[in-house]
């Protein structure tokens, strides 16, 4: 049976890295579905035996770690009793080249990088970063400039999945890598993220990257309704800001982890001149009173802005 | 300043359940596992797990599996731990204590425990 | 699991000597060049307090005489010049894997 093509992710790579993709189509994926992975062009579904190197793990496909021989395209199949959907993901593996004598000392020399940006004179902060399924467990993240070991300081200051640069000048751009320790079934890996940080002069009263909608405003809507909301953003291009919803401090998907009855969206963009303009929507399937009057939150970067149901007023005309 | 309170002191019956909890301030709760760990009377002391308020996730030490169920309310910044069947060999002190995620490897902050007595 | 084994189980030290305690893992708890040992101080009716991380790490406000050190499966905590407030039950603990583990303890005594 055919399946309707959602998405393809062009993801590149280290080897020897561990590596996850979570494969999510709200609000198909909220329900039950039957959702598989497989490696193209075989009909093999990708094991979920959590002892082997590939393995599914949920709506994840786990590489523990990374070998050049895994490129290739893999497809995310989701079913449930009416319809199919795929998501592709075309995986190139590199060479790794974590400060190698090629590098002149940088980390960053290959496609695998986020590009962030730091407002000069201003505190910013660099994000690791670090989703993998709940059975890897994260820890002891250390932060690079170049290959040398950022240490805390006043300059800067680690803070869990972020590193907090304080006072940014225009020195501070250049090459960083975080890197962290993750332990699977009592096996230790590193992950390594590599990061080229821009430093840019801030318009006054206006942040990088820009929410355009919400803006801290209000929405009315009854109670048991569906809602989506999209976040829209605007960012420069070199720019890779995390972009999410959260409540409460949490991602959403992780705070209605259980009932899944509100859940991010995909996130779509379109390519402007010299900006990139995102949507990532937040889909309430059944609003419910506990949601009235809490701020669910949109985060690019260092911006953020929210919004808060409120119950319809009455119309007593 | 960081606080871990921890509830009062519990007498209960063998056979019965108990539910106790730790009440966190001065830090932002989901950036930090909150774990809990065992101390026997004159004994060392032993990990049983912790609950990430982040994702929700707990891992659990598997001598304890069964025995304890680690929970929190994030609206109260609070953690509990619920202990079923008790007998005379979880007479304890009990500890909450935290972790950074993701960047920490140690407990830095203490709960000053809550002892639990066993006894018919 | 991973076993501490902490050596001697008490000491008695006088005032503004050292106190060396050794902690033995059954096996590495290094990765990556990190050791995952972890010291803490623990006082008659109080929580513990933690001193040294990652082997070898004073933690913030602990005073300098405190020092850790080691690597794979041998670490010391060394306390010089030892002072009254010092007494105390002394634990090493590994976050190498879970389930994390403690040591036994060590009791410092103050001659």
């Known amino acids: 049976d055919t399946c309707e093509d959602i998405f393809m992710h062009n993801v590149i790579i280290s080897e020897g890295q561990p590596f996850p993709f979570n494969c999510t189509y709200p609000p198909e994926t909220n329900g039950a579905v039957n959702l598989t992975w497989y490696k193209t062009p075989s009909k093999s579904p990708v094991s979920n035996n959590r002892h082997l190197r590939v393995h599914q793990d949920q709506t994840w496909i786990l590489f523990l770690p990374l070998t050049l021989e895994d490129s290739g395209i893999y497809q995310c199949v989701i079913r449930n009793a009416h319809n199919c959907y795929q998501i592709a993901v075309n995986l190139t593996v590199l060479k790794n080249h974590w400060c190698d004598s090629s590098m002149e000392g940088s980390p960053v020399n290959s496609p695998d990088v986020y590009q962030q940006i730091l407002p000069i004179g201003k505190s910013g902060s660099l994000n690791c970063h670090l989703y993998f399924p709940e059975s890897c467990a994260l820890d002891s993240i250390k932060w690079y400039k170049g290959c040398e070991e950022i240490k805390a300081g006043k300059k800067y200051s680690p803070s869990g999945a972020k590193l907090l640069v304080n006072n940014v000048a225009v020195e501070d751009g250049g090459s960083y890598a975080c890197s962290a320790r993750l332990t699977h079934l009592g096996r230790h890996f590193t992950i390594r993220n590599y990061i080229a940080v821009n430093t840019k002069e801030v318009e006054y009263g206006r942040r990088i990257p820009n929410i355009t909608y919400p803006k801290n405003n209000s929405i009315e809507v009854p109670l048991g309704s569906t809602l989506i909301v999209n976040c829209n953003i605007t960012d420069t291009k070199e720019n890779t800001n995390l972009r999410c919803w959260r409540v409460n401090n949490t991602l959403v998907d992780d705070y209605y982890k259980d009932s899944k009855r509100i859940q991010e969206g995909i996130e779509t963009n379109v390519s402007l001149r010299d900006q990139i303009r995102y949507t990532v929507n937040i889909t309430f399937l059944k609003v419910k009173m506990e949601d009235y009057g809490r701020p669910f939150t949109c985060h690019a970067g260092v911006s953020a802005a929210y919004i808060i149901l409120i119950y319809p007023v009455p119309d007593f005309r | 300043e960081v606080q871990l309170q921890q509830s009062g002191p519990e007498l209960v019956k063998p056979g019965a359940s108990v539910k106790m909890s730790c009440k966190a301030s001065?830090?932002?709760?989901?950036?930090?596992?909150m774990h809990w760990v065992k101390q026997s009377h004159g004994k060392s002391l032993e990990w049983i797990g912790f609950?990430?308020?982040?994702?929700?996730?707990?891992r659990y030490n598997q001598k304890f599996k069964g025995k304890a169920t680690l929970t929190v309310q994030k609206s109260s910044s609070t953690a509990y731990m619920d202990l079923r069947s008790l007998t005379s060999e979880d007479s304890a002190v009990y500890y909450c204590?935290?972790?950074?995620?993701?960047?920490?490897?140690?407990?830095?902050?203490w709960g000053q425990g809550t002892t639990l007595t066993v006894s018919s | 699991d991973i076993v501490l084994t902490q050596s001697p189980a008490s000491l008695a030290v006088s005032l503004g000597q050292r106190a060396t305690i050794s902690c033995k893992a059954s096996?590495?708890?290094?990765?990556?060049?990190?050791?995952?040992m972890n010291w803490y101080q623990q006082k008659p009716g109080q929580p513990p307090k933690l001193l040294i991380y990652?082997?070898?790490n004073l933690e913030s406000g602990i005073p300098a005489r405190f020092s850790g050190s080691g690597s794979g499966t041998d670490f010391t905590l060394n306390i010089h010049p030892v002072e009254e407030e010092d007494a105390a039950t002394y634990s090493c603990?590994?976050?190498?894997?879970?389930?994390?583990?403690f040591g036994g303890g060590a009791k410092l005594e103050i001659k």
């Open positions: 990652a082997a070898s």
């Open positions: 096996q590495s708890v290094d990765y990556d060049g990190d050791s995952y």
């Open positions: 204590t935290r972790q950074e995620i993701y960047y920490s490897n140690y407990f830095d902050y």
């Open positions: 609950f990430n308020p982040n994702n929700g996730g707990t």
């Open positions: 001065g830090y932002t709760f989901t950036d930090y596992n």
């Open positions: 603990q590994q976050s190498y894997e879970d389930p994390y583990t």
